[in-house]
């Protein structure tokens, strides 16, 4: 089965927490991690928003 | 300032359905949302993601297939329908809505949901 984009972290996401367990055998969560799943909607919305303020500029 | 209360949590048996509403105090179109949970002794997870205008939506991948999410702009309402719920789904349920680079900013108090086996 193909990866899905945001069970993965991406380095540019600082700290992250696959949404699979099994990428994280060390269990790195802490206080401030935020799921990889989190952090792609984040991403995507924030994209978004951005996108809609440039256009408003 | 957005007010944020969370409703139809309770108990069901595993495989039992449940519907979340969250009630927002103003107009929330302009806004993401999103649901969270967080279970005894562990961290508030992500569970589900909705853009403004009902698209751009993300699951966290345990709930995917099970859970949906949907908003009714006319209403400032948000929705989680549960489906084939697990014991591992217990928890309590937020909502929250507007993002920044660090988070969402709006959250709501949350509705206990107990899923038992």
């Known amino acids: 089965l193909p990866t899905l984009p945001w069970s993965v972290c991406q380095e540019e996401w600082g700290d992250c927490l696959p949404s699979d367990p099994d990428l994280d055998p060390v269990g790195t969560i802490t206080n401030e991690t935020k799921s990889s799943a989190e952090l792609y909607f984040l991403k995507t919305v924030l994209q978004q928003k951005d996108g809609i303020e440039d256009g408003l500029g | 300032q957005v007010q944020l209360q969370e409703s139809g949590g309770g108990v069901v048996q595993t495989g039992g359905s449940l519907t979340l509403s969250c009630k927002a105090s103003?107009?929330?179109?302009?806004?993401?949302m999103a649901w969270f949970r967080q279970a005894p002794g562990m961290e508030r997870e992500f569970v589900a993601g909705?853009?403004?205008?009902?698209?751009?939506?993300h699951y966290l991948d345990s709930v995917k297939g099970r859970f949906t999410i949907s908003r009714d702009n006319t209403k400032n309402t948000l929705s989680l329908q549960m489906n084939s719920l697990r014991p591992g789904d217990t928890a309590v349920y937020y909502c929250?809505?507007?993002?920044?680079?660090?988070?969402?900013?709006?959250w709501g108090q949350g509705t206990q949901v107990t899923v038992s086996s």
């Open positions: 929250a809505a507007d993002v920044t680079k660090s988070g969402f900013i709006y």
């Open positions: 103003r107009r929330t179109s302009g806004f993401a």
């Open positions: 909705i853009g403004r205008t009902g698209d751009n939506i």
